[in-house]
Amino acid sequence: HSFGPGPGLGTPRSPCNARGPCRLFFRVCLKPGVSQEATESLCALGAALSTSVPVYTEHPGESAAALPLPDGLVRVPFRDAWPGTFSLVIETWREQLGEHAGGPAWNLLARVVGRRRLAAGGPWARDVQRTGTWELHFSYRARCEPPAVGAACARLCRSRSAPSRCGPGLRPCTPFPDECEAPSVCRPGCSPEHGYCEEPDECRCLEGWTGPLCTVPVSTSSCLNSRVPGPASTGCLLPGPGPCDGNPCANGGSCSETSGSFECACPRGFYGLRCEVSGVTCADGPCFNGGLCVGGEDPDSAYVCHCPPGFQGSNCEKRVDRCSLQPCQNGGLCLDLGHALRCRCRAGFAGPRCEHDLDDCAGRACANGGTCVEGGGSRRCSCALGFGGRDCRERADPCASRPCAHGGRCYAHFSGLVCACAPGYMGVRCEFAVRPDGADAVPAAPRGLRQADPQRFLAGVIAVIVVVVIAIVAGIVVLVISRKKRMAKYEKAEIKEMGEMHRELNA
């Protein structure tokens, strides 16, 4: 494990301040999985403080990443069955040493909290937690103390007699009906927290505790590692046998001494303090979050978990932040719903991952016979007469631009518009002024301008009127034909669009 400044956080910070040497401690606290992580509830499942802490003295220019840490293992004894789900709280404390008022000063450097799932007897689970500028790398596992076994450290009954001979008030043991369930009466005074018994009048200690009544923590025992604690009145006995004498590790496990105790390296398929727990099989359901267990048909074969989307870890116990992979394209907002991933797309984009750009002509076509024009990374619709809006879906008001001159009144028409001219004006847009004698019509000219040749001018005006009439007739013919074509195209586009919408809704 390691504790130090996180990456990319500039110059490594020293955990000690300028007041001299310091030591780091880890406090590990286990709470039931149902408790609120943020609340200061009791460490109901257990708590422990790291021991064998080296002193860290700050030297100028020394990297904080190389700071010495407590003994690599922090053991937290827990009572009753292992719940599988728990809240893990790890606090990193600094003890400032040296001469200053009030003795040693304690400061909480960092506190990481997380809800975890872990089956007892499984492999080490690795984790990295960041808080502020600090980063903590650690591993954790749960192991059962005998006689508890299994993923939940259930205390199994000891074989006493056949169910037919179970005494009054006693019932057959589950899951072993050929045994009897009988409450053991431990030695009077045996610690209920740190001791247990399998036979009447005995007191066996959980790991980390010693003494006849299991009330003495191993770390605070006055005996040296090489001595065995005796009764309270006798102090220490002479050196007894070593922890590995007689090899306490079952099933071929190899024993190694660790700070006055022992640790068993178990062969594959066995777990527990003394390798007494046979391996987990797929039938035990070791894979969390619905993970698929493969292999592990018998205790000697290892299992592998195939995790559902959004989970990882050897037992699928860790949730992946799938949004950190930025699956939503084009600036879409990622939402990890746990059982699914959703992208909320920005305007102009669509699709499960916002991969479809609605702002290009490959997207939806312009409606009502409009044509799509691309340019500058965006698209716009050039709409047919009488239509407007982004996709030419809105009916345009041709009179909105006040096209009729000289106070003419505008009327919208299926093919465009018609101007009803004010008295004294004529023309498609009322642009011609009519002479008072009715002889001819002239374009409304600015005051002060005069026509030099009335005859030639009149001939020109008549020619213009004839051209305009011919143009209007030809225009109407063209419009009627194109409208028929446009309506057919529009119906096709509508059918295609309905199909697309249906497909999108189903997806």
Epitope: P83, C287, N289, G290, G291, P309, L341
Partner: antibody
Framework: EVQLVESGGGLVKPGGSLRLSCVAS????????MNWVRQAPGKGLEWVGQ??????????HYAESVKGRFTISREDSKNTVYLQMNSLKTEDTAVYYC????????WGQGTTVTVSS | NIQMTQSPSSLSASVGDRVTITCKAS??????VSWYQQKPGKSPKLLIY???NRYTGVPSRFSGSGSGTDFTLTISSLQPEDFATYYC?????????FGGGTKVEIK
């Protein structure tokens, strides 16, 4: 050996109710997500719903076609998962299977539900 | 929901033949695809998970491949006990959905 055994199927009228059970053996039942999957006569497989673990507050998820009508529950002490089916429709006629996990690794033999007037 | 389209819906083959069944997803499902075998009157059995991994106890003649939207189940040498209906299923997005099935019959 892992075994899942469904029961409770039968003939029921439209609008009626039925409760299916699935008893598991050979597995640590409380550690497994449980699902119901159905298969209409001559048709393919359709996921119906799922119930997760005690540590997940027994969270349930359902297919849109059964939401509000079907309810899944479990009794870990009895190694049993249930499917309560209300307001049954003719289209609910199918063989109902219980399965484990996210990937449907273990399956029961199925129980037949017929909804007909 | 993601649609899984299986083809063919049925096929006839002889013992020893190489059989290929395809499955197409309506959108990218990564490699979160499983294949199941179902014999008449029996429950389905998991054959392949993660698109290409054989489940415990599945013979090596069964293999799966593909990623994204196109997936394949191959039986390298068809055996008499392999005549059944095969289903693909996607597990990328909730809810899980299945293909319509492919019935493998004796020619």
């Amino acid at each position: 050996e892992v075994q899942l055994v469904e029961s409770g199927g039968g003939l029921v009228k439209p609008g009626g109710s039925l409760r299916l059970s699935c008893v598991a053996s050979g597995i640590t039942f409380s550690n497994f997500w449980m699902n119901w999957v159905r298969q209409a006569p001559g048709k393919g497989l359709e996921w119906v719903g799922q119930i997760r673990l005690k540590s997940d507050d027994y969270a349930t998820h359902y297919a849109e076609s059964v939401k509000g009508r079907f309810t899944i529950s479990r009794e870990d002490s009895k190694n049993t998962v249930y499917l309560q089916m209300n307001s049954l429709k003719t289209e609910d006629t199918a063989v109902y299977y219980c399965t484990t996990g996210y990937y449907f690794d273990y399956w029961g033999q199925g129980t037949t539900v017929t909804v007909s007037s | 929901n993601i649609q899984m389209t299986q083809s063919p819906s049925s096929l006839s083959a002889s013992v020893g033949d190489r059989v290929t069944i395809t499955c197409k997803a309506s959108e990218n499902v990564g490699t979160y695809v499983s294949w199941y075998q179902q014999k008449p009157g029996k429950s389905p059995k998991l054959l392949i998970y993660g698109a290409s991994n054989r489940y415990t106890g599945v013979p090596s003649r069964f293999s799966g491949s593909g990623s994204g939207t196109d997936f394949t189940l191959t039986i390298s040498s068809l055996q008499p006990e392999d005549f059944a209906t095969y289903y693909c299923g996607q597990f990328y997005s909730f809810p899980s959905t299945f293909g319509g099935g492919t019935k493998v019959e004796i020619k």
